[in-house]
């Protein structure tokens, strides 16, 4: 089956959600771990990640179609300390599959706003820190 990983971001007020989505077949969930790393070019692993999610097979989902599992990492207030390069990754202990998402970046600007760049689903998100709006 085709397994892939995508990265996305959303804003709710001052909160920034970084989302790692893994698309996989239902039976492939067991033993899969999804994780998010910061500033790690080559050694992104569950052990070095900011957050990880171990997937479980959901018996309630019927059929053998593709399903998605999401890891959400929420930053309540983005600060200059959050500037850096992030990457969503996943690996399966059963099959040995390793997935590495595209690198994306948070840049905190001198004006007190921040931008998220490098996301494949919406190439460029710009957030105003004070008003909490998406432009």
């Amino acid at each position: 089956g085709c397994i892939n990983i995508t990265s996305s971001a959303s804003q709710e007020g001052t909160r920034l959600n970084l989302i790692c989505t893994v698309w996989h077949k239902k039976e492939e969930a067991e033993g899969f771990v999804v994780f998010l790393c910061k500033d790690r070019s080559g050694d992104c692993s569950p052990e070095t990640s900011l957050k990880q999610l171990r997937l479980k097979r959901d018996p309630g989902i019927d059929g053998v179609g593709e399903i998605s599992s999401q890891l959400m990492f929420t930053i309540s207030q983005v600060t200059p300390l959050h500037s850096g390069t992030y990457q969503c990754c996943a690996r399966s202990q059963k099959s040995g599959i390793r997935l590495q998402g595209h690198f994306f970046s948070i840049l905190f600007t001198e004006t007190g706003n921040y931008t998220v760049t490098g996301l494949k689903q919406r190439q460029h998100l710009e957030f105003s820190h004070n008003e909490g709006t998406l432009s």
Epitope: D39, E47, T74, T79, L81, G84, H129
Partner: antibody, heavy 119, light 107 residues
């Protein structure tokens, strides 16, 4: 168990230098931004400086800018505070603290180290 | 720079009493954090993001507020709650600021 152990505190004369260290254990040090927070005797808390997880970005309160330098060595799980041109108003207990990644709270604190600046 | 002021500066409460400590900001802030500090000890995070209790904090504590006014409340004061409480916020560019503290004593 997260542990932060500060060292390097001393009695120094005004204008002199001092370097504080904070040895960290019990967590993936290179993932976390770190900070120094100080407390003058019988006074309140005052943020001094912060450094990003990789060490590339650092930030200071106005009163220490140009005099203090925060740094870190991720290979040694240690952060530092180089304090130059010390003044009597820098006299305080200096705490090493971790930045919570998802919030703006300081979630782990060391026991602190005393710095006294006096002639 | 956003300045935080706390009231009262010091207070004494009897066991079982309801206690409220207030923190006011000179401009609107998004969240307020609270720390507890006992003599000779380092501060401990007590309430974060305005209303979330830190691990191990008894549920007699609560936090609330928005904009420029925030508070920490103890529903039934106990002897172990005697300490100094500090509020703290983040904003750009002044970064991290603390309130002057409220010293809470037990009768």
């Amino acid at each position: 168990e997260v542990q932060l152990v500060e060292s390097g505190g001393d009695l120094v004369q005004p204008g002199r230098s001092l370097k504080l260290s904070c040895a960290a254990s019990g967590f993936t040090f290179s993932n976390y931004a770190m900070a120094w927070v100080r407390q003058a005797p019988t006074k309140g808390l005052e943020w001094v400086a912060s450094i990003s997880n990789g060490g590339g970005n650092s930030f200071y309160r106005d009163s220490v800018k140009g005099r203090f330098t925060i740094s870190r060595d991720n290979a040694k799980n240690t952060q530092y505070l180089q304090m130059d041109s010390l003044r009597s108003e820098d006299t305080a207990t200096y705490y090493c603290a971790t930045h919570n990644y998802e919030s703006t709270v300081f979630d782990y604190w060391g026991r602190g180290v005393m710095v006294t600046v006096s002639s | 720079e956003i300045v935080l002021t706390q009231s009262p500066t010091t207070m004494t409460a009897s066991p079982g009493e309801k206690v409220t400590i207030t923190c006011r900001a000179s401009s609107s802030v998004s969240y307020m954090h609270w720390y507890q500090q006992k003599p000779g000890a380092s501060p401990k995070p007590w309430i974060y993001e305005t209303s979330k209790l830190a691990s191990g904090v008894p549920d007699r504590f609560s936090g609330s507020g928005s904009g420029t006014s925030y508070s920490l409340t103890i529903n039934n004061m106990e002897a172990e709650d005697a300490a100094t409480y500090y509020c703290q916020q983040w904003n750009y560019p002044s970064m991290y600021t603390f309130g002057p503290g409220t010293k809470l004593e037990i009768k």
